[in-house]
């Protein structure tokens, strides 16, 4: 069965910068990726970025840059403005819509004891949904 993995890392050079990496492990082609924070989009989370393989990307602050890393993985750079967006304690979710599998979503966060530059392991947390 397909899986989605999520990594969250703090940049070693800029402690206020975070990057979310997400990937889809499975067959089929990706038609859309949605990244949210604070929980899954549609379940109390806030949409941060939408990436389409042909039409490009759309992001909302505090997202800084959303981009494709491979055909099945993306990265999203975020700028932490301090107390208003405490990313260190935030859950980030990535939802991959693929054909013909449907939608798969997984969430992750920065590990509590993360040193700058370290990231969460690329394993899906229990929130894994197939729509």
């Amino acid at each position: 069965t397909p899986e989605v993995w999520v990594q969250v890392q703090m940049e070693a050079t800029e402690l206020s910068s975070f990057t979310v990496h997400c990937g889809f492990l499975g067959p089929g082609s990706i038609s859309l990726v949605t990244v949210s924070w604070g929980g899954p989009d549609g379940a109390g989370g806030t949409k941060l970025a939408v990436l389409h393989p042909e039409l490009g990307t759309r992001q909302w602050a505090p997202a800084r840059q959303a981009r494709w890393e491979t055909q099945s993985s993306i990265s999203l750079a975020l700028e932490d403005s301090g107390a208003s967006s405490p990313f260190a304690n935030t859950t980030f979710c990535c939802k991959f819509a693929s054909f013909p599998e449907g939608s798969w979503e997984s969430c992750g966060s920065l590990p509590p004891s993360s040193d700058p530059g370290l990231s969460a392991p690329p394993t899906p947390v229990p929130i894994l949904r197939a729509d």
Epitope: D41, G42, G44, G45, T46, K47, H52, G56, R58, A61
Partner: antibody
Framework: QIQLQQSGPELVKPGPSVKISCKAS????????INWVKQRPGQGLEWIGW????????KYNEKLKGRATLTVDTSSSTAYMQLSSLTSEDSAVYFC??????????WGQGTSVTVSS | DIVMTQSQKFMSTTVGDRVSITCKAS??????VAWYQQKPGQSPKLLIY???NRYTGVPDRFTGSGSGTDFTLTITNMQSEDLADYFC????????FGAGTKLELK
Amino acid sequence: QIQLQQSGPELVKPGPSVKISCKASGYTFTDYYINWVKQRPGQGLEWIGWIYPGSGYTKYNEKLKGRATLTVDTSSSTAYMQLSSLTSEDSAVYFCARDSFYAMDYWGQGTSVTVSS
Amino acid sequence: DIVMTQSQKFMSTTVGDRVSITCKASQNVGTAVAWYQQKPGQSPKLLIYSASNRYTGVPDRFTGSGSGTDFTLTITNMQSEDLADYFCLQYSSYLTFGAGTKLELK
């Protein structure tokens, strides 16, 4: 079809506040940001702020110095903008607009606010 | 804040003309630019998104181009119904609009 229906024109005195509404229909209200935009007669457009109805997350144009407050009522698919400490500079047409992958793709018809003593 | 500069406030044109409206961003915004048309008493109407993608239902005489800091909206074979205000929007960092360009008949 997708529609954003805004409340009617407002004539208000300087000082207090005004609250205008934007009722969305034809799509899932909680899935799209709502932007608010100001247009003064013969002038350009100015972004006021946005709200994400799915979570209530807001961002504001810092030039407004905290005078704007954006809220939503998801049960009625309605977004609200309240503007306080009104002056004549706030006399304008205010638009709500749905913010999607395609930037602002659907707009309300606009609400005229006149601030006059 | 990112500033979007539309240097031409007014442009005179005639039916059948090719018209190019430009917009310059104060810093790199990639392709996060949209173009809108607005007629008096109406709401803005989306024409172009992601700098060069024509929105659904927009006639193919409207074309967007550019990336980084310089953007252009081109109308080929100008029609009388195209007389309106046109403005650009950047959505790379929050949202800022150009001041607008008004197309009028010569």
